[in-house]
C-alpha cells in the first residue's frame, strides 16, 4: 500500500569495487522520485541523493568512513511534485537494502602490472598499488594500506612459446621469480583475499609480456 501511483523500490543491490560503492535499484521512476538513507547498524540514518529520478546513489563517501562497519540503506519513494505526500500509514513508502560490509564484500578491481625487470635469471614483477577512496589523515589509502596482509596477489607466468601457467604468490606487491635465460615470458596477476568466502578474487590483469615497453632487461 502507499500513495496512488507510487511504487516501492525493489532489487536493491550494492555495486562496489575497491570501495567505490553505489546502491542500485528498480524501477525506473514514472511520476515519482527517490531519496536514499544509509546507516550503520547502531548509527543514525543519513539522507543522500535527495528526490532523485536516478535509480542509483553513490554512497562511497559514507561507507569509507569505516569500511569494517556493516551498513544498511533504504530507498524512499515519493510522488513527483508532491514529496510531502506519505503512504497510507503516514510514512513514505520505502524498501530496505541487504546489509553490506565493505571490507568483506567490495569487489577487488582488476589489478595492473606496473613494471617488470629482468636481471639474469630472475624477474621482479611489481603490481600497481591502486589508490582507493578510503581516507586516513586526509590522505587516500591504497588497497594494500586498507587490506594489509589480508590481500595477496597471484602471479601467472608462462613462456611465450608455451601454454602452461606457473604461479607465484606474494603478500606484498612484488614478485621475484626464476626464469630461463633467453626465454620471453608473459605475466598476469590476480588479487585474492583468501579469508573471504565470496568475492575472493579479482579479474585477471591485462597480460604483459617481455619485449614490450613495461619491461627492462639487465645482464
Amino acid at each position: 500500500s502507499g500513495t496512488t501511483n507510487t511504487v516501492a523500490a525493489y532489487n536493491l543491490t550494492w555495486k562496489s569495487t575497491n570501495f567505490k560503492t553505489i546502491l542500485e535499484w528498480e524501477p525506473k521512476p514514472v511520476n515519482q522520485v527517490y531519496t536514499v538513507q544509509i546507516s550503520t547498524k547502531s548509527g543514525d540514518w543519513k539522507s543522500k541523493c535527495f528526490y532523485t529520478t536516478d535509480t542509483e546513489c553513490d554512497l562511497t563517501d559514507e561507507i569509507v568512513k569505516d569500511v569494517k562497519q556493516t551498513y544498511l540503506a533504504r530507498v524512499f519513494s515519493y510522488p513527483a511534485g508532491n514529496v510531502e505526500s506519505t503512504g497510507s500509514a503516514g510514512e513514505p513508502l520505502y524498501e530496505n537494502s541487504p546489509e553490506f560490509t565493505p571490507y568483506l564484500e567490495t569487489n577487488l578491481g582488476q589489478p595492473t602490472i606496473q613494471s617488470f625487470e629482468q636481471v639474469g635469471t630472475k624477474v621482479n614483477v611489481t603490481v600497481e598499488d591502486e589508490r582507493t577512496l578510503v581516507r586516513r589523515n586526509n590522505t587516500f589509502l591504497s588497497l594494500r594500506d586498507v587490506f594489509g596482509k589480508d590481500l595477496i596477489y597471484t602471479l601467472y607466468y608462462w613462456k611465450s612459446s608455451s601454454s602452461g601457467k606457473k604461479t607465484a604468490k606474494t603478500n606484498t606487491n612484488e614478485f621475484l621469480i626464476d626464469v630461463d635465460k633467453g626465454e620471453n615470458y608473459c605475466f598476469s596477476v590476480q588479487a585474492v583475499i583468501p579469508s573471504r568466502t565470496v568475492n575472493r578474487k579479482s579479474t585477471d590483469s591485462p597480460v604483459e609480456c617481455m619485449g614490450q615497453e613495461k619491461g627492462e632487461f639487465r645482464e
Epitope: Y156, A168, K169, P194, K201
Partner: antibody
Framework: EVQLVESGGGLVQPGGSLRLSCAAS????????IHWVRQAPGKGLEWVGY????????YYADSVKGRFTISADTSKNTAYLQMNSLRAEDTAVYYC?????????????WGQGTLVTVSS | DIQMTQSPSSLSASVGDRVTITCRAS??????VAWYQQKPGKAPKLLIY???FLYSGVPSRFSGSRSGTDFTLTISSLQPEDFATYYC?????????FGQGTKVEIK
Amino acid sequence: EVQLVESGGGLVQPGGSLRLSCAASGFNIAYYTIHWVRQAPGKGLEWVGYIDPSNGYTYYADSVKGRFTISADTSKNTAYLQMNSLRAEDTAVYYCARDPQSFSSPFDYWGQGTLVTVSS
Amino acid sequence: DIQMTQSPSSLSASVGDRVTITCRASQDVNTAVAWYQQKPGKAPKLLIYSASFLYSGVPSRFSGSRSGTDFTLTISSLQPEDFATYYCQQHYTTPPTFGQGTKVEIK
C-alpha cells in the same frame, strides 16, 4: 561443509582414455584452484596438474603433459581430468584437492580418491 | 623443479615417544611448506601449513619448524592414531612437489 568427490575411475587398456570428475560442494570452485594428485599403489604422492577455474589457466607435470587435460565447469562446480594415451605407469589413485590460494596455500581439502587401473 | 628430500623413509616408535621427521628443499622455498598425514586407503590430511602453523582441528602435539631450507615435523608424544605415513610438500613454486613420505610404524 566443504566436500570434494571424485568419480570416473576404473579399468582401462593401455592407450585408452578415461575422464575423471571432481564434484565440489560447500564452496565455489571459481574462487579457488583445483589440483589433481595421484598415488601409485604403495608409492608416494605425485602432483599431476592444476586449473584455476576463474580463468582456465592450467599447468601439468612433465609426466602427463600432452596426454592429460584439466578442465572445469563452474556452473556444475566440477573439475575434470581427461586422460588420454594411458600407460601402465598411470595406474594410481587419483585425488582432487582444493588450493585456497592463500599466501601459504597448501591443499586444505582432498577428495576420497578414485582408482585408475591401466592394464591389458 | 624443487626437490623435497624427506627422511627417514620409515621409523618404528612406541606410544608416548617423541618423533621427528625432516625435509630438505633443494632451493629456497621461504616458509611455503606443508605437512600431511595419510592413513591406508584414505586421502591425505593437512596438519601443518606455512612451515609452522597448525591447521584447524589438528592436535597440538604436532608442530613444524624451519631452519633455512630444512623443515621438521615433530610429534611430541606419539598416540595410537598417529601411526600413518607423513608427507612434506613445497608450494612455493609450480610444480608443487612432495617428499617421498615417512611411514611411522609401531615398535
